[in-house]
């Protein structure tokens, strides 16, 4: 909680730059048609771009990026019974960002 | 890109953490009424809980929260000409997360 | 329920630009590719853009590279696709889909499109 | 770039008949083959994907078969709502490619 006596800091920009989020691994990514399973893990952790640039014409993308294969259990639910399977999910990780313009408007010649 | 040797390893699950979030400065946190101005930065680094749980019945939640004031540039432009001010903006930072039970809709009495 | 909606089509003069957008909703839009397959007035389907989960991986066929730019804000659920130097030839009905887990899937989802006509 | 042809372009079927349409790839594609249904003003509907496997909610009289390069999507008994036009893609490599179409009318 906030002390009556806390300052203000000035803010900091968060700046363009790789960090870590939370990517959920959807049953859809696995099996489009069957419901009937479980995918352990249910979420990962990625490295991707994020923070803001100088202006809105600028945004933050990544410049280099890496796919990496995970293997997660696909756990089938038969006759009230686990089985369990493997499967492989491809991750997206960011290496490297880049304040890059927005692919804007361009003039009519 | 992907080496063709490429091994799936085990996906390992994103734990229920505080991670490092991006928070955009909305110029209506500002000020509701008026659009005639910009803020720095625009975007600032929080802590926020984030990842998963063993079941679907459980949610990554903060069990402790601060706040914490920032002080930010509100840049008005008068006749074409920026006119510096300050603004604080009142920050949420996810200080420790839990696995929580999700509340069940309760049934109608 | 799984829902796409596209927006931004309209008349532009040939040489011009527009910005199109699709505002997903009901699925982990983050999770997931996403495409551009346009449809012009009584032709076939055309397979335009397509872009990775992250945003960082992008494929054009020959017709539109350098032209078009698809792109994504996961946090908003939202993809564009801006169309630079229009032709007569873009006049199209444009669709977005949602296209798995890599670029080699099949499209799952679609929205109901949203018409661009370049003439002068 | 992969080329995919659909043959016949256009068929006229009645109600209750069993309809084949082939389609066709300029090299192998493996099973990355995929088949879509799409009526007049609508978007197209995922029907087959993997060139046999039943996309959910599709009903069981539609099937596909094949690979490699020749495949076939069967309407085993075509029903009023089936009057519509049916594409073949490869997803197996960029650029993706769809087939030209055919339309299944009512004789």
């Known amino acids: 909680s906030l002390g009556s006596l806390t300052v203000a800091e000035p803010a900091m920009i968060a700046e363009c730059k790789t960090r870590t989020e939370v990517f959920e691994i959807s049953r859809r990514l696995i099996d489009r048609t069957n419901a009937n399973f479980l995918v352990w893990p249910p979420c990962v952790e990625v490295q991707r771009c994020s923070g803001c640039c100088n202006n809105r014409n600028v945004q933050c993308r990544p410049t280099q990026v890496q796919l990496r294969p995970v293997q997660v259990r696909k756990i089938e639910i038969v006759r009230k019974k686990p089985i369990f399977k493997k499967a492989t999910v491809t991750l997206e990780d960011h290496l490297a960002c880049k304040c890059e313009t927005v692919a804007a408007a361009r003039p009519v010649t | 890109s992907l080496g063709s040797l490429t091994v799936a390893e085990p996906a390992m699950i994103a734990e229920c953490k505080t991670r490092t979030e991006v928070f955009e400065i909305s110029r209506r946190l500002i000020d509701r009424t008026n659009a005639n101005f910009l803020v720095w930065p625009p975007c600032v680094e929080v802590q926020r809980c984030s990842g998963c749980c063993n079941n679907r019945n459980v949610q990554c939640r903060p069990t402790q929260v601060q706040l914490r004031p920032v002080q930010v540039r509100k840049i008005e432009i008068v006749r074409k000409k920026p006119i510096f001010k300050k603004a604080t903006v009142t920050l949420e930072d996810h200080l420790a997360c839990k696995c929580e039970t999700v509340a069940a809709a309760r049934p109608v009495t | 329920e799984v829902q796409l909606v596209e927006s931004g089509g309209g008349l532009v003069q040939p040489g011009g630009s527009l910005r199109l957008s699709c505002a997903a909703s009901?699925?982990?839009?983050?999770?997931?590719?996403m495409t551009w397959v346009r449809q012009a007035p009584g032709k076939g389907l055309e397979w335009v853009a397509s872009?990775?989960?992250?945003?960082?991986?992008?494929h054009y066929p020959d017709s539109v590279k350098d032209r078009f730019t698809v792109s994504r804000d996961n946090a908003k659920n939202s993809l564009y696709l801006q169309l630079n130097s229009l032709r007569a030839e873009d006049t199209a009905v444009y669709y977005c889909?949602?296209?798995?887990?890599?670029?080699?899937?099949?499209?799952?989802?679609w929205g109901q499109g949203t018409l661009v006509t370049v003439s002068s | 770039d992969i080329q995919m042809t659909q043959s016949p372009s256009s068929l006229s079927a009645s109600v209750g008949d069993r309809v084949t349409i082939t389609c066709r790839a300029s090299?192998?594609?493996?099973?990355?083959l995929n088949w879509y249904q799409q009526k007049p003003g609508k978007a197209p509907k995922l029907l087959i994907y993997?060139?046999?496997s039943l996309q959910s909610g599709v009903p069981s009289r539609f099937s596909g078969s094949g690979s490699g390069t020749d495949f076939t999507l069967t309407i085993s008994s075509l029903q009023p709502e089936d009057f519509a036009t049916y594409y073949c893609?490869?997803?197996?490599?960029?650029?993706?490619?769809f087939g030209g179409g055919t339309k299944v009318e009512i004789k």
């Open positions: 872009i990775s989960a992250g945003g960082g991986i992008t």
């Open positions: 889909a949602e296209s798995g887990g890599d670029i080699y899937s099949d499209f799952d989802y």
């Open positions: 893609q490869q997803s197996y490599s960029t650029p993706l490619t």
């Open positions: 009901g699925f982990t839009f983050s999770s997931f590719w």
């Open positions: 993997a060139a046999s």
């Open positions: 090299q192998s594609i493996s099973n990355y």
